[in-house]
């Protein structure tokens, strides 16, 4: 299939011009080589008309030219001085010869239709109304008042003053007249369609001093927004239909031969191919909203209406507003996987991509929610701290540079199961979705933490050790401290007498960590993990209290606070002795269906921005060390 | 040279339907655009629909939503499905081929064919 995409239909009248886009993927190559534009014709060839290398047939002579614009991968064709013999097959394409990457193009033009001189022209979109001015002389204000559509053969009644109506106009069609004015009337038409386009005429009075005025009325379908989106992105509808329709229910439907089938709507119809990839958002009270998809798929192309009508779905003469998608299987966002499975206890490493240009953007993970309109919660953001229901068991790592961020979530339940979202306060395309599945656990975790019910004494020397089994010999172990803005991982150097160590017991094959002497600040979660280079492994989760010596009652430790974790991450963490101060943006986020809410969340977080200090608030930093005695079973 | 033969006009009454089909033979593989003209009583010729090598269809306000134009997988069978037929579609119904030469505009015109609604 040819990632060039452009206008399927132009269509202008004689003496007009017309502005043709054409859009092309991302590439230098793209964005240097001949751009045309070529008419086809007998025979399957396709004759030159003009291109990017300068040249232009004589045809087109003083009435074209052709633009490209790399830095939006498009180009655009200007024609001028529209004849009847324009129409006809067109391709805009690249390449050095026509038989290159192409887009068909039907330009169709019009004879510009031969109306009496005195016609006044009213145009307007379908679903929208008209009022028509109907001037008269005053002899004639007592007399009938009508307005009739022309037929061939007649003029078919439309509105009377003495209230006539046709029955296709019931409910439609007004006649009055405004305040003392006695020398025009006007009549109002409203949820015009295709059907309503034609002559009309106004008349006051009767016999050959009755006044008339010849209307044009052309009704007209709204011109398709071209979207060109990459594969695996997302894009946003933005929907304007105006203030006479805030109050009704809205929808978005794609076309499908003749019907156009609603995708969602706003009284909580959403087919099922957009579970877990859609929102829509009321913008305002002006009847704007918004649709956003993410994780777009090749099926997904296509064209798109969105209208608003009180059953929340088509209408005939209601507004609508219409875009033709294109989806670029040329995509510059990585193929990941879209489904994850994990198992109860266990965890799930999710790597989300994001636009390597943008490293510094803010990253965020929220869950998408089915319910009312369906929404987004941010669930955890590099600078948003982790909602207090994912404490110790959910972390952002971000490694600037290389286009991926991964996010841990561990202690798995059946109720984590769901769609995830992967966004970011940068390029809205790189939206990502994600299904988590999560089956219940069949076998022993690879990790496993002694003590599980870890009280450590204040003061005194505690260590929990960390099992893994010989598979994992050749990986590097770690533990981090988990903070609801990440999980620290401890250096690998000692730095001074008040340390943790990590040490490698060939024989048993495991990892401890010895905090001596133990500290208040001590207490909370930990994670124990393998990974190789950047990529992580599985990790498990263990929450550890701190008692003083004389208090002898045990602490108890948060509801499943030490089930166990399995991860595969991708990133190593960034520190994260951030500033305690509280995130007001995060508690109750919103949907994220467009940039300004991210960038709020986004803005109001440089508060919480990183310090870079990796030690401990007391000043005192902790260390551990890791050794790895290769040991083959 | 293109040769194009039309077929299905007649009688209808007002609000039934009729099928117009046109053949194209000859230089067929050219055509650019097929479609539907028509000239009824007292009017000059007027454009009906037509459809173009991409399969956009394009149609005249006055009969958008009644009339429906297909063709076949060759391209050299055009179909006018007529509904809601009126009084005011009576007419001869010509169908038009039209071919680029690489530097020209050619119509190609068939015979017409008689289209009468009744009332």
């Known amino acids: 299939k040819s990632p060039i995409f452009g206008p399927q239909e132009v269509s202008s009248i004689e003496g007009d011009s017309v502005s043709i886009t054409c859009y092309y993927p991302d590439t230098s190559v793209n964005r240097h080589t001949r751009k045309y534009w070529c008419r086809q014709g007998a025979s399957g060839m396709c004759t030159t008309l003009i291109s990017s290398n300068g040249y232009l047939s004589k045809e087109y002579s003083g009435r074209a030219n052709l633009i490209n614009f790399p830095e939006n991968n498009t180009f655009v064709i200007n024609i001028e001085q529209l004849t009847q013999d324009d129409t006809g097959s067109y391709k805009c394409g690249l390449g050095t010869s026509n038989r290159g990457l192409s887009f068909d193009v039907s330009l169709e033009v019009s004879q510009v239709p031969e109306l009496p001189s005195d016609t006044h022209v009213y145009t307007k979109d379908i679903g929208r109304n008209v009022t028509i001015e109907c001037p008269f002389k005053r002899e004639n204000a007592p007399s009938k008042k009508s307005l009739c559509k022309k037929t061939n053969q007649s003029c078919e009644l439309v509105i009377d003053s003495t209230e006539k109506v046709n029955p296709s106009y019931i409910g439609r069609a007004k006649l009055f007249m405004k305040g003392t004015d006695l020398t025009v009337f006007y009549v109002n038409i409203s949820h015009l369609t295709h059907n309503d386009a034609g002559l009309y005429i106004c008349q006051a009075g009767e016999g050959p001093s009755a006044d008339k005025k010849n209307v044009d009325l052309q009704v007209l379908a709204p011109e398709p927004e071209l979207l060109y989106k990459d594969l695996r992105s997302s894009v946003t509808f933005e929907c304007d239909l105006g203030r006479e329709v805030a109050n009704e229910a809205k929808y978005l439907c794609r076309m499908n031969k003749e019907t156009c089938d609603v995708i969602i709507n706003t009284l909580g119809k959403r087919d099922p191919d957009f579970e877990g990839r859609i929102l829509i958002t009321p913008k305002d009270d002006n009847g704007r909203f918004s649709v956003l998809i993410t994780g777009l798929r090749k099926e997904d192309a296509g064209h798109y209406q969105c209208g608003a009508h009180s059953s929340g779905l088509p209408q005939e003469g209601w507004p609508i507003q219409t875009w033709q998608l294109f989806v670029n299987e040329e995509s510059t966002i990585p193929n990941r996987r879209s489904v994850v499975k994990g198992v109860t206890g266990g965890s799930v490493a999710i790597a989300c991509p994001y636009n390597p240009k943008e490293s510094s953007s803010l990253k965020y993970w929220c869950r998408w929610e089915g319910d009312g309109n369906g929404h987004c919660p941010v669930l955890v953001g590099t600078q948003a701290q982790v909602q207090e229901e994912y404490e110790g068991r959910l972390a952002l790592f971000d490694q600037p540079g290389n286009g991926t961020y991964t996010v841990i979530l561990n202690q798995l339940t059946t109720e984590d199961a769901g769609f995830y979202w992967c966004l970011t306060n940068g390029d809205s395309r790189w939206r990502t979705t994600i299904e988590l599945q999560v089956a219940e656990a069949t076998r022993e975790p690879n990790l496993e933490v002694t003590p599980q019910n870890a009280t450590a004494v204040l003061g005194e020397t505690f260590t929990v050790s960390c099992h893994y089994p010989c598979k994992f010999y050749s990986q590097e172990k770690y533990w981090c401290k988990w903070s609801n803005k990440g999980c620290h991982i401890l250096p690998s150097h000692d730095e001074g007498a008040r340390q943790s160590s990590v040490s490698c017991d060939q024989s048993s094959q495991l990892v401890s960590m010895t905090l001596n002497p133990v500290s208040k600040e001590d207490e909370g979660w930990y994670w124990c993990g393998v990974k190789q280079g950047q990529t992580y492994g599985e990790t498990t989760a263990i929450y550890i209290a701190v008692e003083e010596r004389t208090r002898g009652s045990s602490h108890v430790n948060p509801t499943d606070a030490n089930a166990r974790a399995k991860v595969a991450l991708e990133e190593e963490v960034v520190d994260s002795s951030i500033s305690e101060k509280e995130n007001k943006a995060i508690p109750n986020p919103g949907p994220f269906a467009n940039e300004r809410e991210i960038q709020n969340v986004g803005d109001q977080a440089q508060e919480n921005r990183a310090s870079g200090d990796a030690g401990s608030a007391d000043g005192q930093s902790r260390s551990s060390s890791s050794k790895h005695h290769h040991h083959h079973h | 040279q293109v040769q194009l033969v039309e077929s299905g006009g007649g009688l209808a009454q007002a609000g039934g339907s009729l099928t117009l089909s046109c053949a194209a033979s000859?230089?067929?593989?050219?055509?650019?655009?097929m479609g539907w003209y028509r000239q009824t009583p007292g009017n000059s010729r007027e454009f009906v629909a037509r459809i173009f090598s991409n399969d956009v269809t394009h149609y005249a306000d006055s009969v958008t939503g009644r009339f429906t134009l297909s063709r076949t997988q060759d391209k050299n069978t055009v179909s006018l499905q007529m509904n809601s037929l009126k009084p005011d579609d009576t007419g001869v119904y010509y169908c038009?081929?039209?071919?680029?030469?690489?530097?020209?505009?050619?119509?190609?015109w068939g015979q017409g064919t008689q289209v009468t609604v009744s009332s």
């Open positions: 038009n081929a039209r071919i680029w030469t690489g530097s020209t505009t050619v119509d190609y």
């Open positions: 000859g230089t067929a593989a050219g055509i650019d655009v």
